[in-house]
Interface confidence: low
Amino acid sequence: ESLGTEQRVVGRAAEVPGPEPGQQEQLVFGSGDAVELSCPPPGGGPMGPTVWVKDGTGLVPSERVLVGPQRLQVLNASHEDSGAYSCRQRLTQRVLCHFSVRVTDAPSSGDDEDGEDEAEDTGVDTGAPYWTRPERMDKKLLAVPAANTVRFRCPAAGNPTPSISWLKNGREFRGEHRIGGIKLRHQQWSLVMESVVPSDRGNYTCVVENKFGSIRQTYTLDVLERSPHRPILQAGLPANQTAVLGSDVEFHCKVYSDAQPHIQWLKHVEVNGSKVGPDGTPYVTVLKTAGANTTDKELEVLSLHNVTFEDAGEYTCLAGNSIGFSHHSAWLVVLPAEEELVEADEAGSVYAG
């Protein structure tokens, strides 16, 4: 059984369904904007063929009007594109989503480079940000099993078009703050995290602001352990290393486990010219294991100082808990001091117990 199974992305966490057909969404766009209307199937299930209708007439796709089963895009919108839009089931003509679209004369994105110029009071909509789909933001607490993909959305509007930023537990949140990174989709006002792990738990706040004001929304993410599971090891760690004779090397291993993990670092050795025993088990020597004063953080790093040619070879990070074991391996290549560094093969071998 490969670790790939353990780390598969189980799927997207279910999103809050769209408004009831009776509810009409009021949307305001600026002239020249792209009008984007989204109508996901109710309950997340299949919804069959659909038709988009404006003011009672079926929309004909064109270069400017892009029609999809769950999405409608009207490019370079003008005043004439204002009206009542609905997405209906083709067979029953049941209204799945209903939108009231208003296209104003003012473009919705401010051109002010420095942000100093106040917008003139021309009577058009200028002002602080507001939520365009508040009913999509009702679910403040999202609980998903580990390995799911999570998406937080804060659809907003304002004039000038507001910016969106994200905080985790009150602090600026950027891609480098989590292994696996994040996807910020500014046009969709969303934050996406794939393959979530327990360390992703916390409060996520979207901050939407323009020069007229600021609004924010906080979501709480809880990541449930998929018990009973052996530890999950971060893909790609430890990574293969190439080092010059006499230099220092560090191997890293990131372990996720809800049950207390036990971490060991092993080096593969040969016994009588053989790498494996009669039962196929590799011969190894334990380089580092939990001691009275070692922390998990310390165990996640193996440091080799002043490496020699004897240090070259295969190294394994082995993590076990009450459920079972997982292990990842990487190779160390040691080069003579006068040779230039040569990149080792990037992909470390991956095993799972």
Epitope: G44, L142, P145, T220, E225, S227
Partner: antibody, heavy 116, light 110 residues
Framework: EVQLLESGGGLVQPGGSLRLSCAAS????????MSWVRQAPGKGLEWVSG????????YYADSVKGRFTISRDNSKNTLYLQMNSLRAEDTAVYYC?????????WGQGTLVTVSS | QSVLTQPPSASGTPGQRVTISCSGS????????VYWYQQLPGTAPKLLIY???HRPSGVPDRFSGSKSGTSASLAISGLRSEDEADYYC???????????FGGGTKLTVL
């Protein structure tokens, strides 16, 4: 060996209260999500409530929201379920279970009977 | 009315292969791990299958789980008299923010 031992069940009148306890042993209690699951006589399993390790995030079934409170004391390795405003339909065997996304160990259960 | 749907009963003769189905939706089975539990008469439930198709140690390989889309199934091959029990499927439901079970299937070994 993992063991979960429930206690606190008994006969109570409608509108009354009861507090269930679950003593855990054989594993590091504070590292695990814990849940309560119940089973009415002759019926199927119904998840009641779950609590994340540090009591941070707590979940309840709609049928018990506002009436039941789950809590834990990691120093005592004990899980609790405070049940108020009990109704006849709360009559069931209440199991303590380890896990949140699934349950790998279960206690033997304690019977709660709500009757006048 | 259970969120996950199971047949109320199933039966088979010793040595036979029996399959129990469990259907749900995208917010539970479709996106989350499926678990199967066995409850012998008068005892607490016991974990049989976790994460769709994995067996905890101690569970015979006669028991296997599978999942496709929003449905899952438990297969028991080489049926034995001691397999007579109630079987439940379960999964986390992301819409309800809670765990859901099937109504249970009573397996009779004829």
């Amino acid at each position: 060996e993992v063991q979960l031992l429930e206690s606190g069940g008994g006969l109570v009148q409608p509108g009354g209260s009861l507090r269930l306890s679950c003593a855990a042993s054989g594993f590091t209690f504070s590292n695990y999500y814990m849940s309560w699951v119940r089973q009415a006589p002759g019926k199927g399993l119904e998840w009641v409530s779950g609590i994340y390790y540090g009591s941070g995030n707590i979940y309840y079934a709609d049928s018990v929201k506002g009436r039941f409170t789950i809590s834990r004391d990691n120093s005592k390795n004990t899980l609790y379920l405070q049940m108020n405003s009990l109704r006849a339909e709360d009559t069931a065997v209440y199991y303590c279970a380890r896990g949140g996304g699934g349950f790998d160990y279960w206690g033997q259960g304690t019977l709660v009977t709500v009757s006048s | 009315q259970s969120v996950l749907t199971q047949p109320p009963s199933a039966s088979g003769t010793p040595g036979q292969r029996v399959t129990i189905s469990c259907s749900g939706s995208s917010s539970n089975i479709g996106n989350n791990d499926v678990y199967w539990y066995q409850q012998l008469p008068g005892t607490a439930p016991k974990l049989l299958i976790y994460a769709d198709n994995h067996r905890p140690s101690g569970v015979p390989d006669r028991f296997s789980g599978s999942k496709s889309g929003t449905s899952a199934s438990l297969a028991i091959s080489g049926l034995r008299s001691e397999d007579e029990a109630d079987y439940y499927c379960g999964a986390w439901d992301a819409s309800l923010n809670g765990y859901v079970f099937g109504g249970g299937t009573k397996l009779t070994v004829l």
